[in-house]
């Protein structure tokens, strides 16, 4: 019998330096394109190999981006969020929410990380 699946949610501040093709990740979400039901937040859909985010190593696919340079990403249209990233400057501070899946099974079963949330 499988155990209950819980999520450990943590927040982190990540500072990235823009590379030749941006910050090195793709986003989904927004008020006009909800990626998660009843949540119009902005999520990381892909980390580009050798891009700024991949080289930093902390941002993960499935992370929710809460703010960019202190600007809240709540209730934004998808394109407005994209424009924020495009115009964020050379040094960019991201506040992100990681969601780690942990399975509470029988004793002896280890938790499993699922960065895609």
């Amino acid at each position: 019998m499988n155990g209950r699946v819980d999520y450990l949610v943590t927040e982190e501040e990540i500072n990235l330096t823009r590379g030749p093709s941006g910050l090195g990740f793709n986003i989904v979400g927004g008020t006009d394109q909800q990626y998660v039901s009843n949540d119009s937040g902005i999520y990381v859909s892909r980390i580009k190999e050798n891009g700024a985010a991949a080289l930093d190593g902390r941002l993960q696919e499935g992370d929710k981006i809460l703010s960019v340079n202190g600007q809240d990403l709540k209730n934004l249209l998808h394109q407005d969020a994209v424009d924020l990233f495009r115009n964020a400057g050379y040094a960019v501070s991201l506040r992100v929410q990681h969601r780690l899946q942990v399975q509470n099974g029988p004793i002896g079963h280890r938790g499993e990380g699922d960065p895609s949330g």
Partner: nanobody
């Protein structure tokens, strides 16, 4: 350096077919939401078809059922198969990529993309 180079345009009769190619260099194509755009003389640029990194596709109503977008990740090339061409498809066709958006509809409707090719001319006459 990020570069997109289109090819495959030409003169074709109504009802004919063409296959456009967009070769990418300086980046890995499947890391980007990317699409095909066109601009006819005196008209605004429009998004024709776009594809997300996960393969979701969008087509403008005017080309649905006639055009097919695809991507070859080994060749790092984007394609647009154009069938049943009409005179109103005459335009300069560009490919363009977004560094951030992974929403194919938004990419095709955006006027603020990050990498553009020079275009290839398609004339249906």
């Amino acid at each position: 350096e990020v570069q997109l180079v289109e090819s495959g345009g030409g003169l074709v009769q109504p009802g004919g077919s063409l296959r456009l190619s967009c070769a990418a260099s300086g980046f890995t194509l499947d890391d980007y939401a990317i699409g095909w755009f066109r601009q006819a003389p005196g008209k605004e640029r429009e998004g024709v078809s776009c594809i997300s990194t996960h393969g979701s596709t969008y087509y403008a109503d005017s080309v649905k059922g006639r055009f097919t977008i695809s991507r070859d990740n080994v060749k790092n090339t984007l394609y647009l198969q154009m069938n049943s061409l009409k005179p109103e498809d005459t335009a300069l066709y560009y490919c363009a990529a977004s560094y951030y958006s992974d929403y194919e509809v938004a990419v095709c409707r955006s006027d603020a993309l990050d990498a553009w090719g020079q275009g290839t001319q398609v004339t249906v006459s």
